[in-house]
């Protein structure tokens, strides 16, 4: 057999479909790899050939298009299952060829089972709704092309095991599910079941998505730096460890990149000839507002370091802010007096770091250690 441009296994398209449901799978060649569409290829005399490799097998086999009731068929660049079976799982290849040209790509297809509450290994798309924002809708996804517009399917929406009926603020409206006003209690998995007739048979399409209720843009504010602040002074003696936390609150903003960074004397810590460690932790509220903490640490601070300017900066789509930490060299107390309030700098640091933990509650911490020399 002559050479064929083999695009390999396209694992980016990890296609998952439910057992015993129709599935229409487009050949990825025309979607991602070739600069022309199926119609152009077909009119140029190219033929689309399908074959597959079963799960846990190495043998490539032709697809059997002569099954009862045309269970598997091909229509233009689409491979149809009406319906799928569990053992249809495998790697499928579509090959476009004529006597002088050949191009092919393989992709994995996984047929998955669901339980009576629609739980399954299926990866779920996430749809974000703004909290208390007014009417918002989600739409039953990926049902185009399964039935003609003349067919009127029945659509039933579920939240987990339960049909959505008589809900306070959620109304099924055909392919759409309307949230009159979204609350945290609306977080969860929503399933639409689309039932339609075809050639005297009834088919079901099940689509589940995760709804996540997030902070509303109405309530969004620029980043808020909680620490450093004017109430805490970082007073250190040379040789001690200097720890300064920068704790920043970010309102949830769709597709916003939240950034926190330190500057020392106006430069990035990388560009300063001192041994600085920055540890970052991130936690999220239930509405995906974010608290980022970057703790700047100098293990053995020098008197020069204590004269430097330490500024925490934060940026989001809502704006940029900065706050300087008040850092001082501790003046040793006279030998003959009892040590007074001047000795509480270390406690302040500990209290400040502790406060971060309290503020973040049960949040997840991701620690990144950046050593700057």
């Amino acid at each position: 057999s002559e050479r064929c441009d083999d695009w390999g296994l396209d694992t980016m398209r990890q296609i998952q479909v439910f057992e015993d449901e129709p599935a229409r799978i487009k050949c990825p060649l025309f979607e991602h790899f070739l600069k022309f569409n199926y119609s152009t290829a077909h009119s140029a005399g190219l033929t689309l050939i399908w074959y597959w490799t079963r799960q846990d097998r190495d043998l490539e086999e032709p697809i059997n298009f002569r099954l009862p009731e045309n269970r598997i068929s091909k229509e233009k660049d689409v491979l149809w299952f009406r319906p799928t079976l569990l053992n249809d799982t495998g790697n499928y290849t579509c090959m476009l060829r004529n006597t002088t040209y050949c191009s092919k790509v393989a992709f994995p297809l996984e047929v998955v089972q669901k339980d009576s509450c629609f739980n399954s290994p299926m990866k779920l798309p996430v749809h974000k709704l703004y909290i208390e924002y007014g009417i918002q809708r989600i739409t039953c996804p990926n049902v185009d092309g399964y039935f003609p517009s003349s067919v009127k399917p029945t659509i039933t929406w579920y939240m987990g095991c339960y049909k959505i009926q008589n809900f306070n603020n959620v109304i099924p409206e055909g392919m759409n599910l309307s949230f009159l006003i979204a609350f945290i209690s609306n977080n969860g998995n929503y399933t639409c079941v689309v039932t339609y007739p075809e050639n005297g048979r009834t088919f079901h399409l099940t689509r589940t998505l995760t709804v996540k209720v997030v902070g509303s843009p109405k309530n969004a504010v620029p980043p808020v730096i909680h620490s450093p602040n004017d109430h805490v002074v970082y007073e250190k003696e040379p040789g001690e460890e200097l720890l300064i936390p920068c704790t920043v609150y970010f309102s949830f903003l769709m597709d916003s990149r939240n950034e926190v960074w330190w500057t020392i004397d106006g430069k990035k810590p990388d560009d300063i000839p001192i041994d600085v460690t920055i540890n970052e932790s991130i936690s999220h509220s239930r509405t995906e507002d974010e608290t980022r903490t970057q703790i700047l640490s100098i293990k053995k601070v020098t008197s020069e370091d204590l004269k430097r300017s330490y500024v925490c900066h934060a940026r989001s789509a809502k704006g940029e802010v900065a706050k300087a930490a008040t850092v001082k060299q501790k003046v040793p107390a006279p030998r003959y007096t009892v040590e007074g309030g001047g000795g509480t700098g270390g406690l302040n640091d500990i209290f400040e770091a502790q406060k971060i933990e309290w503020h973040e509650g049960g949040g997840h911490h991701h620690h990144h250690h950046h050593h700057h020399h």
Epitope: D115, S116, M159, Y162, N166, F167, S185, G188
Partner: antibody, heavy 122, light 107 residues
């Protein structure tokens, strides 16, 4: 520890209504459903309906449609089952039950109330 | 609605013996079946769900099997506290329905 505590026994006349309460303690953060099941003396279990207190969703078994009303007061974590037009065959122990989430059908009757005996007699 | 039929209605077993209870569904319920135990004057208690998964705190002597329309609850060695009524319940289709129960009594 999640518990369901139901109201006390009731004696009712035929044609009247009864309202049984079910108070939940230690409620989970996410939505859950409260189920109502009844058991006539010496008989099996019969599902009546459910409510999802935080979302308001409810449904009733066909047999009880028009006679049963299930409600909930989220502020007190209490669900109520009201049965109207009572007849002698409604004499039964009425149970509430619940699970931890809306997503695990097998455990929707995970925790049960102690039951409320309703006697319908003239 | 799916009708659940349990057999036998009463099962007489000696302590230490094995008890096998059956439950049949009028149509396939896949593995969406639960078993409950009820003692006199008490609320039912969840034993098994998903046809074979033991609920929290349920002893290993209780086991469930089956799928589709035929299910079995087995108590490998009956203890005195196991004498009770056992119900199966399907949750594959609404309305969720219970069997009429099997009473396990001391022989």
């Amino acid at each position: 520890q999640v518990q369901l505590v139901q109201s006390g026994a009731e004696v009712k006349k035929p044609g009247s209504s009864v309202k049984v309460s079910c108070k939940a303690s230690g409620s989970p953060a996410e939505p859950y459903a409260i189920q109502w099941v009844r058991q006539a003396p010496g008989q099996g279990l019969e599902w009546m309906g459910y409510i999802i207190p935080s979302l308001g969703g409810y449904d009733y078994a066909q047999k009880f449609q028009g006679r049963v009303t299930i409600t909930a007061d989220e502020s007190t974590s209490t669900a109520y089952m009201e049965l109207s037009s009572l007849r002698s065959e409604d004499t039964a122990v009425y149970y509430c039950a619940r699970g931890q989430t809306l997503y695990d059908a097998g455990r929707q009757f995970d925790i049960w109330g102690q039951g409320t005996l309703v006697t319908v007699s003239s | 609605e799916i009708v659940m039929t349990q057999s036998p209605a009463t099962l007489s077993v000696s302590p230490g013996e094995r008890a096998t209870l059956s439950c049949r569904a009028s149509q396939s319920v896949s593995s969406n079946l639960a078993w409950y135990q009820q003692k006199p004057g008490q609320a039912p208690r969840l034993l098994i769900y998903g046809a074979s998964t033991r609920a929290t705190g349920i002893p290993a002597r209780f086991s469930g099997s089956g799928s589709g329309t035929e299910f079995t609850l087995t108590i490998s060695s009956l203890q005195s506290e196991d004498f009770a009524v056992y119900y199966c319940q399907q949750y594959n289709n609404w309305p969720w329905t219970f069997g009429q129960g099997t009473k396990v009594e001391i022989k």
